[in-house]
Interface confidence: medium
């Protein structure tokens, strides 16, 4: 495996972009149980109604690999576990993706990505520790191509859930 | 990490009114959803109001009509107007913000350490 993006690799703060840049995705640094900060996107407005909140990584490289896969762990709320919220209320979000020669990209435009999946939370998860807290993580992993252009971007599209981005990995597999 | 600190409680007659504050330390919360609930005696905590970041309100249908949740960002506080106060409104308010932090079950959710009211007819 050949990994092109690591979220929890990077040094300081992730800085993909967000859209809105208020009120929707925020990153959220986390200690882990050796004090070490892991990067995090969180969303949660599960009360109110309509969300298109939209989070996008930086420019990937694909380094002429035709089918990438993407590993996503996160946790996702259950709905029911949630006090006094309404109909609102999701627990998937969506996954997409954008090919592009340019890696300076400035902005989402939303009619540009192509969607991948829906991204639900399994029942099966691992549990990790940070600190004062057990972490559930889920972990589902989508792979696309064929790609042909010289890189992609990577979108998260959230609808109305309580999620926290924990990792985000993107690799290919040598041949 | 949040913290939220309720204040303005206190003994009030019936048909009186109070306003509880409850204010934020750490980091601001001007992105979530913000709530009161209440716990009387030998009862489960249940929902009074919340308000979202976008200003949408929900009440239970017992306070519908007399009390009003608000909030100011920029002093990291949501309030609650109480009027015209019924004996039944005697409980220990919390305040209540939803973060999307992980964890399991409780360990989303920050809690105030309450203030009572006590309502005498």
């Known amino acids: 495996e050949v990994t092109l993006l690591d979220s929890r690799s990077v040094q300081g703060e992730l800085g993909w972009i967000a859209s809105p840049l208020e009120g929707g995705w925020e990153e959220v640094s986390i200690m882990d149980e050796k004090n070490t900060p892991i990067r995090t996107y969180q969303v949660c407005n599960v009360m109110e109604p309509s969300q298109n909140n939209w989070l996008r990584t930086d420019w990937i490289t694909r380094e002429g690999a035709q089918r990438v896969y993407i590993e996503i762990k996160f946790t996702l709320r259950d709905c029911n576990s949630l006090p006094g919220v309404m109909g609102t209320c999701k627990e998937t979000f969506n996954l997409y993706y954008y090919e592009s020669d340019n890696d300076k990209e400035r902005f989402i435009r939303e009619n540009q990505f192509v969607k991948i999946d829906t991204i639900a939370a399994d029942e099966s998860f691992t549990q990790v520790d940070i600190g004062d807290r057990i972490m559930k993580l889920n972990t589902e992993i989508r792979d696309v191509g064929p790609l042909s252009k010289k890189g992609f971007y990577l979108a998260f599209q959230d609808v109305g859930a309580c999620i926290a981005l924990v990792s985000v990995r993107v690799f290919y597999k040598k041949a | 990490q949040v913290q939220l600190q309720e204040s303005g409680g206190g003994p009030v007659r019936a048909g009186e009114s109070l306003r509880l504050s409850c204010t934020a330390s750490?980091?601001?919360?001007?992105?979530?959803?913000m709530g009161w609930f209440r716990q009387a005696p030998g009862k489960e905590r249940e929902l009074v109001a919340v308000?979202?970041?976008?200003?949408?309100?929900n009440y239970a249908d017992s306070v519908k009509g007399r009390f009003t949740i608000s909030r100011d960002d920029a002093k990291n506080t949501v309030y609650l107007q109480m009027n015209s106060l019924k004996p039944v409104d005697t409980a220990v308010y919390y305040c209540?913000?939803?973060?999307?932090?992980?964890?399991?079950?409780?360990?989303?959710?920050?809690w105030g350490q309450g203030t009572q009211v006590t309502v005498s007819s």
């Open positions: 209540h913000v939803v973060l999307a932090v992980v964890g399991t079950g409780n360990e989303y959710d920050v």
């Open positions: 308000i979202t970041p976008g200003g949408n309100t």
């Open positions: 750490g980091r601001a919360f001007s992105t979530y959803t």
